[in-house]
């Protein structure tokens, strides 16, 4: 035998203060004839929330047209939610009777609780830059959410990270909660263009998580590699020497040339180029005046990158009438 069912699909409805809450109730039969009323709570002390036939309920509106003979949707909207509205709401079918209607069947109830959205996650990286293959820590914080259940995930360039620790405070009952998570990320040489993302999912966000991001360009230092070479062609009594500084980040770089230990003050030609991975290349050309009577010349290209200790590379020019082989070595 078919029987009327009262369907209240949500067991729990989280609402925000000041917003409108929709409480769903549908029936599967037009029989027995009689109204559907809404109550908060159960038993003799229950509070009437909505009765289509009588009473004044200024904050309550119906979703559907209840005057329609075939209406099966008795959902209501309650506007301007306040903390006083929390509780369990029941839609109840009454059978038409004389002298008064008789309760026939109740829905399972929907608990209305106050929810608060988490704030936009803020991601902070390390205070100082670190070189590739080292581990850096990023923190993510979000505040002011309720209920306590929350999900936080970390991503690097879309790939989920697993090395992180998360705390939600306080541990006991509270009006609102905060989350703090620390992720450990191993830096790769190509991470200049990488991003870490902290993603927070909460029931109040209705499946649309909040994200906070940090650029690894703020956390990484890619040290340069140096190469000093002598151009094979000689123009008169000048030799062109090139210092190539490759694959460094950030851009902050000081380059000085020394000739036999003496720092050269004169202008040198240079170019800066950016690589696809976000690192930079710097090329500096140095013209050395030579003569047949001159002693051997040792050129040093010294680079100070991002405030770190200087690195240098030397090139010995053994200058004779017939130019001999070149040799080079590096010093820290």
């Amino acid at each position: 035998e078919e029987e009327l069912q009262m369907i209240q699909p949500e067991k729990l409805l989280l609402v925000t203060v000041g917003k409108t809450a929709t409480l769903h109730c549908t029936v599967t039969s037009l029989l027995p004839v009689g109204p559907v009323l809404w109550f908060r709570g159960v038993g003799p002390g229950r509070e009437l929330i909505y009765n289509q036939k009588e009473g004044h309920f200024p904050r309550v509106t119906t979703v559907s047209d209840l005057t329609k003979r075939n209406n099966m949707d008795f959902s209501i909207r309650i506007s301007s939610i306040t903390p006083a509205d929390v509780g369990t709401y029941y839609c109840v079918k009454f059978r038409k009777g004389s002298p008064e209607n008789v309760e026939f069947k109740s829905g399972p109830g929907t608990e209305m609780a106050l929810g608060a959205k988490p704030s936009a996650p803020v991601v902070l990286g390390p205070a100082a830059r670190t070189t590739p293959e080292h581990t850096v820590s990023f923190t993510c914080e979000s505040h002011g959410f309720s209920p306590r259940d929350i999900t936080l995930k970390w991503f690097k360039n879309g790939n989920e990270l697993s090395d992180f620790q998360t705390n939600v405070d306080p541990t006991g009952q509270s009006v609102a909660y905060s989350i703090r998570s620390t992720a450990r990320v191993v830096l790769d040489p190509w991470d200049v263009r990488s991003q870490v993302i902290c993603e927070v999912a909460h029931v109040t966000l209705q499946g649309d998580p909040l994200r906070g991001t940090a650029n690894l360009s703020e956390a990484i230092r890619v040290p340069p590699t140096l190469e000093v070479t002598q151009q094979p062609m000689r123009v008169g009594n000048q030799v062109n020497v090139t210092c190539q500084v490759r694959k460094f980040y950030p851009q902050s770089l000081q380059l000085t040339w020394s000739e036999n230990g003496n720092v050269c003050q004169r202008e040198t030609a240079s170019t800066l180029t950016e690589n696809k991975d976000g690192t930079y290349n710097w090329t500096s050309w140095f013209l050395v005046n030579i003569s047949d009577q001159r002693d051997d010349v040792v050129l040093t290209c010294q680079v100070k990158h991002d405030g770190q200790l200087a690195v240098s590379k030397r090139l010995a020019l053994e200058v004779t009438v017939h130019q001999k082989d070149q040799s080079s070595d590096a010093t820290p």
């Epitope: 035998e1 078919e2 009327l4 769903h24 549908t26 599967t28 039969s29 037009l30 029989l31 004839v33 979703v63 559907s64 047209d65 329609k68 003979r69 075939n70 209406n71 099966m72 949707d73 959902s75």
Partner: antibody, heavy 119, light 107 residues
């Protein structure tokens, strides 16, 4: 007066999803508080009620099809749609959209569209 | 689901005859019953709603009666244009269900 027009592919491969749209003209889908239904009729057979939707989003599907059916409404386009997943030859039928009016009867129908499920 | 049993499944009558179709519900559906006419290759058309009310524009030779589980649909004087299949439909309990149909032919 209100008119309904079904549209969608006439041939669907087995295991795929059947998708039909019903366009409402001559009135607003959301103004009258009507239910919007889908009904089908197998070749040479009777009528089978698939389900309906109210503009508020309330839906009810025939339990015999419930796991495979989705009915949705797009009030901006004045349309409602039917999706039936994992179709088999048994889903070959004429599909009708209809309005369930104030007096509960389905008083406006589309002309019907034949859908054949075959590879 | 509510079962709707329609009888007869087909009938043949002469023009001007009184034609009666019955529909029985598997349980009490009050007067939540509709009758439809479907001509070959066409969509169904609502004739009677709420068991006995004539839909707009439907000729008065069509009528319906009944309540509870037993319902009757009558064509007081059969016309050639009445050749069709007739269906009852309950809307007391979801899902809505139809009777198997009665095919009416002219002798």
């Amino acid at each position: 007066q209100v008119q309904l027009q079904e549209s969608g592919p006439g041939l669907v491969k087995p295991s795929q999803t059947l998708s039909l749209t019903c366009t409402v003209s001559g009135g607003s889908i959301s103004s009258g508080g009507d239910y919007w239904a889908w009904i089908r009729q197998h070749p040479g057979k009777g009528l089978e009620w698939i389900g309906y939707i109210y503009p508020s989003g309330f839906t009810y599907y025939n339990p015999s099809l419930k796991s495979r059916v989705t009915i949705s409404v797009d009030t901006s386009k004045n349309q409602f749609s039917l999706k039936l997943s994992s179709v088999t030859a048994a889903d070959t039928a004429v599909y009708y959209c209809a309005r369930e009016g104030y007096h509960s009867g389905m008083d406006v129908w589309g002309q019907g569209t034949t859908v054949t499920v075959s590879s | 689901d509510i079962q709707m049993t329609q009888s007869p499944s087909s009938l043949s009558a002469s023009v001007g005859d009184r034609v009666t179709i019955t529909c029985q519900a598997s349980q009490d559906i009050s007067n939540y019953l509709n009758w439809y006419q479907q001509k070959p290759g066409k969509a169904p058309k609502l004739l009677i709603y709420d068991a006995s009310n004539l839909a707009t524009g439907v000729p008065s030779r069509f009528s319906g009666s009944g309540s509870g589980t037993d319902f009757t649909f009558t064509i007081s004087s059969l016309q050639p244009e009445d050749i069709a299949t007739y269906y009852c439909q309950q809307f007391a309990y979801l899902p809505w269900t139809f009777g198997g149909g009665t095919k009416v032919e002219i002798k």
